[in-house]
């Protein structure tokens, strides 16, 4: 048993039929010694008396809020949550496996630049009685500070018969140098509590590996005289690290017809302009990627040919 | 410890091309190592991230762009002395700071070159003959060092009398390639910045 926060404790249980459970000793937080009684939840049924209460925790019915009283007055509470371990593996019932980039990916994180700010998100099909808290650090043995905000519900989607809820959190490394070479990964830890079930999820990454620039901005077309060609120009996204001559991007320019089956013409360039042939009803899209470290491409910025 | 913004020179940057080749070569070599050593811990998640240049050079700090010198988190640099007669910029306007930066890059390359050559010698003794260092990568390191054109004492190749542990050597190779790729990215950024300055 360990303390998650004040008056909230997590009991780790091997979860299998007829498991013996865990013996837990609760102590009433009071200077009083005599006349103390214990109840579970809002029940008036007395479970025991004395400053300590010993219980065998086997299932969710044994979890909940234990309260010690004296003469009708509440002295203290202890909320017990369960963390299930089945076949040696901690349960992952609360969050959905996103399966990207690999199986058992529950947390996904992205950064728009090298400033040390990043966003993580996760999915669940649970919509009520759910709380998350997020902690992060650079490295684990001698952790350096990363500050995370509160997790918030960022999107709701319908997936077949199910509704899916996306939560996200923003974190910022306390003292980040954009030019630094990372040798210790960022660790992100999410505590998830659904009712009386506790689970924790972790992710470990280097900022350089989760970079995904915003799409190029100010995408414009300039027709070239007496030609079907156009000059496409764009700018670095505002959110990208500066100076741009140090944090350089490379770009992919695509000409795509109305039909998905039509052949796509693609050009790769380090410049912020390109000359392409603009077909009728086609659209021109540009996306960006770090020029030197191949992390994710940005989403496309698009403009119609006409 | 920052790069001044110099006026562009007509005889600009022979090093940019070489640094781009270097990044391409080390990335290809790392990919090859990951594929060939698929049953070894060779991915970024599996290896320990070690920097053989730590406390010997300070390339990141010495080559910091002017715009980042206001960022206090970037300025916890280590004092290191460098030989400062580089000739990568065709012009004679190479400032002390830029020379410090380029000589730091040169020292990095020299250290990695020695490590890679030592390692290759061990790998050539492996009866499995599973993996060797790409000669192209070693050549590209050499070319960039020549383009930087610093005079520096040659570091003797480390030789070892004991029988090499090939498993350890291959893991060390992965560690070295990951670290060198990260340094090659920094070098490329620096050269791009200098080229634009």
């Amino acid at each position: 048993i360990w303390e998650l926060k004040k008056d909230v404790y997590v009991v780790e249980l091997d979860w299998y039929p007829d498991a013996p459970g865990e013996m837990v000793v609760l102590t009433c937080d009071t200077p009083e010694e005599d006349g103390i009684t214990w109840t579970l939840d809002q029940s008036s049924e007395v479970l025991g008396s004395g400053k300590t209460l010993t219980i065998q925790v086997k299932e969710f019915g044994d979890a909940g809020q234990y309260t010690c009283h004296k003469g009708g007055e509440v002295l203290s509470h202890s909320l017990l949550l369960l963390h299930k371990k089945e076949d040696g593996i901690w349960s992952t019932d609360i969050l959905k496996d996103q399966k990207e980039p690999k199986n058992k990916t529950f947390l996904r994180c992205e950064a728009k630049n090298y400033s040390g700010r990043f966003t993580c998100w996760w999915l669940t099909t649970i919509s009520t009685d759910l709380t998350f808290s997020v902690k992060s650090s650079r490295g684990s043995s001698d952790p350096q500070g990363v500050t995370c905000g509160a997790a918030t519900l960022s999107a709701e989607r319908v997936r077949g018969d199910n509704k899916e809820y996306e939560y996200s959190v923003e974190c910022q490394e306390d003292s980040a140098c954009p030019a630094a070479e990372e040798s210790l990964p960022i660790e992100v830890m999410v505590d998830a509590v659904h009712k009386l079930k506790y689970e924790n999820y972790t992710s470990s990454f280097f900022i350089r590996d989760i970079i995904k620039p915003d799409p190029p901005k100010n995408l414009q077309l300039k027709p070239l005289k007496n030609s079907r060609q156009v000059e496409v120009s764009w700018e670095y996204p505002d959110t990208w690290s500066t100076p741009h001559s140090y944090f350089s991007l490379t770009f992919c320019v695509q000409v795509q017809g109305k039909s998905k089956r039509e052949k796509k013409d693609r050009v790769f360039t380090d410049k912020t302009s390109a000359t392409v042939i603009c077909r009728k009803n086609a659209s021109i899209s540009v996306r960006a990627q770090d020029r030197y470290y191949s992390s994710s491409w940005s989403e496309w910025a698009s403009v119609p040919c006409s | 410890r920052n790069l001044p913004v110099a006026t562009p020179d007509p005889g600009m940057f022979p090093c940019l091309h070489h640094s781009q080749n270097l990044l391409r070569a080390v990335s290809n070599m790392l990919q090859k190592a990951r594929q060939t050593l698929e049953f070894y811990p060779c991915t970024s998640e599996e290896i320990d991230h070690e920097d053989i240049t730590k406390d010997k050079t300070s390339t990141v700090e010495a080559c910091l762009p002017l715009e980042l010198t206001k960022n206090e988190s970037c300025l916890n640099s280590r004092e290191t002395s460098f030989i400062t007669n580089g000739s990568c910029l065709a012009s004679r306007k190479t400032s002390f700071m830029m020379a410090l930066c380029l000589s730091s890059i040169y020292e990095d390359l020299k250290m990695y070159q020695v490590e890679f050559k030592t390692m290759n010698a061990k790998l050539l003794m492996d009866p499995k003959r599973q993996i060797f260092l790409d000669q192209n990568m070693l050549a590209v390191i050499d070319e960039l060092m020549q383009a930087l054109n610093f005079n520096s004492e040659t570091v003797p190749q480390k030789s070892s009398l004991e029988e090499p542990d090939f498993y350890k050597t291959k893991i060390k190779l992965c560690i070295l390639l990951h670290a060198f790729r990260i340094r090659a990215v920094t070098i490329d950024r620096v050269m791009s910045y200098l080229n634009a300055s």
Epitope: D41, Q42, L79, D129, K163 | -
Partner: antibody, heavy 120, light 107 residues
Framework: EVTLKESGPVLVKPTETLTLTCTVS??????????VSWIRQPPGKALEWLAH???????YYNPSLKSRLTISKDTSKSQVVLTMTNMDPVDTATYYC????????????WGQGTTVTVSS | SVVMTQTPKFLLVSAGDRVTITCKAS??????VAWFQQKPGQSPKLLIY???NRYTGVPDRFTGSGYGTDFTFTISTVQAEDLAVYFC?????????FGGGTKLEIK
């Protein structure tokens, strides 16, 4: 002793707004982990959950009725109020309030219910 | 929303019989299922929470089991006072939903 008691009009006209009050005793609406739900039951039919409010004001609504419902509480009066706009004859039902706590997460105490008929 | 399909709708049994009611959720609801008893003219009473936990003061002839999508409620030895409608309810997901109910009648 924990008790909940619903009160409100017996009859409402179509399109009118229904306001129901749940007055609780034996526990405080401001106690951490305390919550109250509203549930209704049309004559001879199954139960339907409408809305829930927690001690800290956080609330949940049944999405199919969300646009018509508002749940609120007045801790000093130990009351939880549910308003339902644009009433229709199909909303004729017995309306219950029930306590649901963040300890056993079950509706462990129910009021006796108040019957509301929607008719012109 | 999660549909709780409760079977059977009606049960006619003799005192002393064993009774089993099932509830099937349209998607997994973990163990977040409660069972209620509603006697004629009364409000519902909580019997079981977390699928298998008997609420305070509930006789031990009432038991619940199940996880995921399939849940069972059992009265081991029916007594005359058990005449009531029994409902299952999930609160894994909003909207919290109830089964259609099982009316238990005693011969």
């Amino acid at each position: 002793e924990v008790t909940l008691k619903e009160s409100g009009p017996v009859l409402v006209k179509p399109t009118e707004t229904l306001t129901l009050t749940c007055t609780v005793s034996g526990f405080s609406l401001s106690t951490s982990g305390m919550g109250v739900s509203w549930i209704r039951q049309p004559p001879g039919k199954a139960l339907e959950w409408l809305a829930h409010i927690w001690w800290d004001g956080d609330n949940y609504y049944n999405p199919s009725l969300k646009s018509r419902l508002t749940i609120s509480k007045d801790t000093s009066k130990s009351q939880v109020v549910l308003t339902m706009t644009n009433m229709d004859p199909v909303d004729t039902a017995t309306y219950y309030c029930a306590r649901r706590t963040r300890v056993n997460y079950a509706m462990d105490y129910w009021g006796q219910g108040t019957t509301v008929t929607v008719s012109s | 929303s999660v549909v709780m399909t409760q079977t059977p709708k009606f049960l006619l049994v003799s005192a002393g019989d064993r009774v089993t009611i099932t509830c099937k959720a349209s998607q997994s609801v973990s163990n977040d299922v409660a069972w209620f008893q509603q006697k004629p003219g009364q409000s519902p009473k909580l019997l079981i929470y977390y699928a298998s936990n008997r609420y305070t003061g509930v006789p031990d002839r009432f038991t619940g089991s199940g996880y995921g999508t399939d849940f069972t409620f059992t009265i081991s030895t029916v007594q005359a006072e058990d005449l009531a409608v029994y409902f299952c309810q999930q609160d894994y997901n909003s909207p919290w939903t109830f089964g259609g109910g099982t009316k238990l009648e005693i011969k």
